[in-house]
Interface confidence: medium
């Protein structure tokens, strides 16, 4: 069971990143699915290595004081959402904006029907050029 | 099937990074090989988790306006090269240069004879100290 | 065999990061253990994908000239310690400090009784908020 999906620019104002099965994507079988373009949902319980990469372009003067944060989150059936992993990068002083990349990855137990998704502080700063932003998992 | 190879400084002007089986490297068997010191080639079709880490030292004034970009690329038999993953980091204002590290990783389907390699915008900025820059894969 | 442990703030002055089985941690079985809150020790020989993520907050003026470096290290029975992976990030100019995240990961052969741990140049700069700093491995 494995998946790798590609970022998709979105007009939605939500902080949850959108993904698509496009380009050189992976969707090994129907035991993992991309739901509503926003979350990877697994049908089998087990240990999974889950990862995300986010490239963004921001400028210190044009952004809030807070850093750019990417969060890998989990929603299990009947449970509250929870943060699994986070990474933070302070905005660049480069103009008009400075690109930076964040990589998250870890091993987590998922229940049947569990979904994982990626949140960012400002989706408008995310880079969607080929290969820059992606999300995936593999079952151990 | 797994491999982990270590960066090698090169006098070549190519943007493709060079690697060696040295230090604490991994080459599990002959189903994966390091070819010409530049690409990992697999003999078996399947899903692979492929990763690269690149540490570099650059300065905004001494570099081009464009950020430092590391790209994980694929060459499959009978197909042309393509970008699988990329990461970008704006150059530092630190002098003489500021170090930064990039990590790339994802799950991809590889065909028999497929090769993966790593391209960077400026190989002269790459750090080759112990553990700083490496490249590998594992078959799921 | 898999583990994922969560960073723990420590009053110790050592450069070795401290970890705990807390939050959404993983410890698949007793073939991998967290020893003294500082190292993951494996009982079985084999190939392992080992990873660490460190988020830190630093300021160029308040820090040494040297960058922030995170190192993934190995101690095998009867052998000297060695560095497997390193990443470096120059300190931010943001005030009071600028957050940055480092991700390390690679495939390595471990012997029975081998331990892996994470060293940083300044543990006081490490961020211990939910999901920011973690450490783990999985056996291939």
């Amino acid at each position: 069971i494995a998946a790798h999906v590609i970022s998709e620019a979105s007009s939605k104002t939500t902080s949850v990143l959108q993904w698509a099965e496009k380009g050189y994507y992976t969707m090994s079988n129907n035991l993992v699915t991309l739901e509503n373009g926003k979350q990877l949902t697994v049908k089998r319980q087990g240990l999974y290595y889950i990862y995300a990469q986010v490239t963004f372009c921001s400028n210190r003067e044009a952004s809030s004081q807070a850093p750019f944060i990417a969060s890998l989150c989990l929603k299990s059936p009947g449970r509250f959402e929870r943060i699994l992993l986070r990474a933070a990068n302070t905005h660049s002083s480069a103009k008009p904006c400075g690109q930076q990349s964040i990589h998250l990855g870890g091993v987590f137990e998922l229940q049947p029907g569990a979904s994982v998704f990626v949140n960012v502080t400002d989706p408008s700063q995310v880079s969607h050029g080929t290969g820059f932003t992606s999300f995936g998992l593999l079952k151990l | 099937i797994a491999a982990h190879v270590i960066s090698e400084a090169s006098s070549k002007t190519t943007s493709v990074l060079q690697w060696a089986e040295k230090g604490y490297y991994t080459m599990s068997n002959n189903l994966v090989t390091l070819e010409n010191g530049k690409q990992l080639t697999v003999k078996r079709q399947g899903l692979y988790y492929i990763y690269a880490q690149v540490t570099f030292c650059s300065n905004r004034e001494a570099s081009s306006q464009a950020p430092f970009i590391a790209s994980l690329c694929l060459k499959s038999p009978g197909r042309f090269e393509r970008i699988l993953l990329r990461a970008a980091n704006t150059h530092s204002s630190a002098k003489p240069c500021g170090q930064q590290s990039i990590h790339l990783g994802g799950v991809f389907e590889l065909q028999p004879g497929a090769s993966v390699f790593v391209n960077v915008t400026d190989p002269s900025q790459v750090s080759h100290g112990t553990g700083f820059t490496s490249f590998g894969l594992l078959k799921l | 065999i898999a583990a994922h442990v969560i960073s723990e703030a420590s009053s110790k002055t050592t450069s070795v990061l401290q970890w705990a089985e807390k939050g959404y941690y993983t410890m698949s079985n007793n073939l991998v253990t967290l020893e003294n809150g500082k190292q993951l020790t494996v009982k079985r020989q084999g190939l392992y994908y080992i990873y660490a993520q460190v988020t830190f907050c630093s300021n160029r003026e308040a820090s040494s000239q040297a960058p922030f470096i995170a190192s993934l290290c190995l101690k095998s029975p009867g052998r000297f310690e060695r560095i497997l992976l390193r990443a470096a990030n120059t300190h931010s100019s943001a005030k009071p400090c600028g957050q940055q995240s480092i991700h390390l990961g690679g495939v390595f052969e471990l012997q029975p009784g081998a331990s892996v741990f994470v060293n940083v140049t300044d543990p006081s700069q490490v961020s211990h908020g939910t999901g920011f700093t973690s450490f783990g491995l999985l056996k291939l």
């Epitope: 380009g23 994507y25 969607h128 050029g129 080929t130 | 464009a66 197909r79 970008i83 990329r86 915008t121 | -």
Partner: nanobody, 116 residues
């Protein structure tokens, strides 16, 4: 439906220049990596150059490095290949290509002949 239409080929003397264009339609051009490939008479397909979706990252085969320049105009959905210092061995049908996961789309091609 993905459509790629190449133009700009022709007969040119060694050392001369040509600019190839590729008009793309049927997909969101600005989101995709694009490439040029070529096929010389009696030979297989050879990758020439590729460019990322934003146009900031380019790659070239060693045989054309320093002579060819790939570029794109996302506002016009057009890919370009500027070919300078042409040689006899550059004679081929040049195809504009869009790589996909399991196959590659390419157009009908445009013939470039380098001869004195």
């Amino acid at each position: 439906e993905v459509q790629l239409l190449e133009s700009g080929g022709g007969l040119v003397q060694p050392g001369g220049s040509l600019r190839l264009s590729c008009a793309a339609s049927g997909f969101t051009f600005a989101l995709y990596q694009m490439a040029w490939v070529r096929q010389a008479p009696g030979k297989g397909l050879e990758w020439v150059s590729s460019i990322d979706s934003s146009g900031s990252d380019t790659y070239y085969a060693d045989s054309v490095k320093g002579r060819f320049t790939i570029s794109r105009d996302n506002s016009k959905n057009t890919l370009y290949l500027q070919m300078n210092s042409l040689r006899a061995e550059d004679t081929a049908v040049y195809y504009c290509a869009k790589p996909e996961r399991d196959f590659d789309y390419w157009g009908q091609g445009t013939l470039v002949t380098v001869s004195s």
